[in-house]
Interface confidence: low
């Protein structure tokens, strides 16, 4: 009976311990479930943030591209809005470039064409005045876009239009015939006829960009 | 004795259950610790992502402002005026005008001032190259904005800054003393010292209008 009592007491203790442990396990299980829930929430939050970050990155990339495009456009527009490119002289409706190299007439013509221009064309006495003034400090000859095949042909500008006789008198080798034709150059304000094969400076001309200034 | 055996058996069962529960608790405790660790990691990740998102938002805001500014500038630049006035040459950040009259240095300086400009200032070898090329077809002298009171004074530009010695060598009357001072001119690519009272062509220079208008 004494043994029996002792065993009963031990059993009561063990049952108590077991119940306590079961309670602990139940509490832990609840905490674990809550923790799992919290972890799932955190994971969801991470997913949302990662998605948002990805979206922001995409938007930023797009803005960056837009920026680059705008900067490009700005560069172009800055150029577009200038009546003439760098190193050219803007006068009235035209841009003029005084070549820094010396070439024959045909090569000079090519150089102007490569710059989206033509050799100098003088349309009026005002044009002539400006050019005479612009080259007043040079003693060298400058090819202009005026030529003729031989003395029996008329003087023609590059666009095919004839020279207006009142504009200027052509001096020099006007009655000479050259295999390469006769071309006109301007020097110290006067216009001369010369063999197109000779090298001289030149003046390129193109329309000034006077839109939306 | 039979009761005793039954109690012993129950006790063994309870001990086994207790041990099992203790094992479960221990496992749960470890899982809980791991879960806590994982949760801390997730929280850290969230913090990092939130910070990154915040930074991206700031960057995006900045880009957005840049974009708006660029669009504004673009609108204004579309209406902006030419970088340089008529008859001037636009090169890099400056406008240049080659005078068509011949005057002494002081008079040349006045002429430039009346055009809201100064006499030529050469800041770099690139500037020098451009000017040398621009006057390559002229044999005439051009005053520049460089002068000194007498040979014991330094060469100064109009804005008071000294000449950088590596740019070019000044030839000619460098050791002469003149009542009007000694001025520098450029001719055929070389720079010479001369009496400021003499007449020569000149080159005016001013900043090109490259600001968004």
């Amino acid at each position: 009976s004494q043994v029996s009592n002792l065993l009963k007491q031990q059993q009561t203790n063990l049952t108590h311990q077991k119940n306590k442990l079961e309670g602990q396990i139940s509490a832990r299980q609840q905490a674990e479930e809550a923790s799992q829930e919290s972890q799932n929430e955190l994971k969801e939050m991470i997913e949302t943030l990662a998605w948002k970050l990805n979206e922001k990155s995409k938007e930023q990339m797009e803005l960056h591209h837009q920026n680059l495009n705008l900067q490009e456009t700005l560069k172009r527009v800055a150029n577009c809005s200038a009546p003439c490119p760098q190193d050219w002289i803007w006068h009235e409706e035209n841009c003029y470039l005084f070549s820094t190299g010396s070439f024959n007439w045909e090569k000079s013509q090519e150089k102007c064409l490569s710059l989206d221009a033509k050799l100098l064309k003088i349309n009026s006495t005002a044009d002539l005045d400006f050019i005479q003034q612009a080259i007043s400090y040079s003693s060298f000859p400058f090819w202009m876009g005026l030529s003729r095949r031989n003395p029996s042909y008329p003087w023609l500008w590059e666009d095919g239009s004839p020279l207006m006789p009142h504009l200027f008198r052509i001096r020099g080798a006007v009655s000479q015939t050259y295999p390469s034709g006769t071309c006109a150059y301007i020097q110290r304000g006067a216009v001369y006829a010369e063999n197109c094969i000779l090298a001289a400076f030149s003046i390129c001309q193109k329309k000034a960009n006077l839109r939306a200034q | 004795s039979q009761v005793s055996n039954l109690l012993k058996q129950q006790q063994t069962n309870l001990t086994h259950q207790k041990n099992k529960l203790e094992g479960q608790i221990s496992a749960r405790q470890q899982a809980e610790e791991a879960s806590q660790e994982s949760q801390n990691e997730l929280k850290e990740m969230i913090e990092t992502l939130a910070w990154k998102l915040n930074e991206k938002s700031k960057e995006q805001m900045e880009l957005h402002h840049q974009n708006l500014n660029l669009q504004e500038t673009l609108k204004r630049v579309a209406n902006c005026s030419a970088p340089c006035p008529q008859d001037w040459i636009w090169h890099e950040e400056n406008c240049y005008l080659f005078s068509t009259g011949s005057f002494n240095w002081e008079k040349s300086q006045e002429k430039c001032l009346s055009l809201d400009a100064k006499l030529l200032k050469i800041n770099s070898t690139a500037d020098l190259d451009f000017i040398q090329q621009a006057i390559s077809y002229s044999s005439f002298p051009f005053w520049m904005g460089l002068s000194r009171r007498n040979p014991s004074y330094p060469w100064l530009w109009e804005d008071g800054s000294p000449l950088m010695p590596h740019l070019f060598r000044i030839r000619g009357a460098v050791s002469q003393t003149y009542p009007s001072g000694t001025c520098a001119y450029i001719q055929r690519g070389a720079v010479y010292a001369e009496n400021c009272i003499l007449a020569a062509f000149s080159i005016c220079q001013k900043k090109a209008n490259l600001r968004a208008q």
Epitope: F103, F140 | S139, G189, A190, E194, A199, A200
Partner: antibody
Framework: QVQLVQSGAEVKKPGASVKVSCKAS????????VHWVRQAPGQGLEWMGA????????AYVQKFQGRVTMTRDTSISTAYMELSRLRSDDTAVYYC????????WGQGTLVTVSS | DIQMTQSPSSVSASVGDRVTITCRAS??????LVWYQQKPGKAPKLLLY???RLESGVPSRFSGSGSGTDYTLTISSLQPEDIATYYC?????????FGQGTKLEIK
């Protein structure tokens, strides 16, 4: 040191052409213009024109326009002056000279035009 | 073209004399004028440029002055080696014209 060495004397018939060379040394050939000056026997100096060796651009006195051609070969630092349709009054010593102002001269080339 | 007129066309002076040669331009040349000395059978030699700048190596007895259209070459004390023909030349505008020359002889 700076030197300009010209080609030797020439005897030509009226109507012919003569080409005088001028080899430069001792300086950067393309930096200075080369000018041509002539001097008829017992006469003064007469400026004929100039060439800019860097670019090849040339300027001639109106009197010689169409008869004179100034060229250069930068690879050998040499300038040339060709005078065509020679007449007896073209008999002269022809000088090449480095300009600004003329500080160095060639030794001169005597061109005699005689039938 | 700018005409350059030298005077006298010839001058005879003694050693030690002061000699003056003048050069007149048909229009103002802003001091862009040079003086050359030429001895028989030789190429000309640069004496002065910019009207009054003495070329290096040229004796200081040579000097130049003038402005506008009128310019002067002065030899302060004539030496035997100065016997030569002297030319002025304008270099303002092409063609760069010369004066006709002044022949200097010893008395």
């Amino acid at each position: 040191q700076v030197q300009l060495v010209q080609s030797g004397a020439e005897v030509k018939k009226p109507g012919a052409s003569v080409k005088v060379s001028c080899k430069a040394s001792g300086y950067t050939f393309t930096d200075y213009e080369v000018h041509w000056v002539r001097q008829a026997p017992g006469q003064g100096l007469e400026w004929m024109g100039a060439i800019h060796p860097g670019s090849g651009g040339a300027a001639y006195v109106q009197k010689f326009q169409g008869r004179v051609t100034m060229t250069r070969d930068t690879s050998i630092s040499t300038a040339y002056m060709e005078l065509s349709r020679l007449r007896s009054d073209d008999t002269a010593v022809y000088y090449c000279a480095r300009w600004l102002p003329i500080d160095y001269w060639g030794q001169g080339t005597l061109v005699t035009v005689s039938s | 073209d700018i005409q350059m007129t030298q005077s006298p066309s010839s001058v005879s002076a003694s050693v030690g004399d002061r000699v003056t040669i003048t050069c007149r331009a048909s229009q103002g040349i802003n001091n862009w004028l040079v003086w050359y000395q030429q001895k028989p059978g030789k190429a000309p030699k640069l004496l002065l440029y910019a009207a009054s700048r003495l070329e290096s190596g040229v004796p200081s007895r040579f000097s130049g002055s003038g402005s506008g259209t009128d310019y002067t070459l002065t030899i302060s004390s004539l030496q035997p080696e100065d016997i030569a023909t002297y030319y002025c030349q304008q270099y303002l505008i092409t063609p760069y014209t010369f004066g006709q020359g002044t022949k200097l002889e010893i008395k």
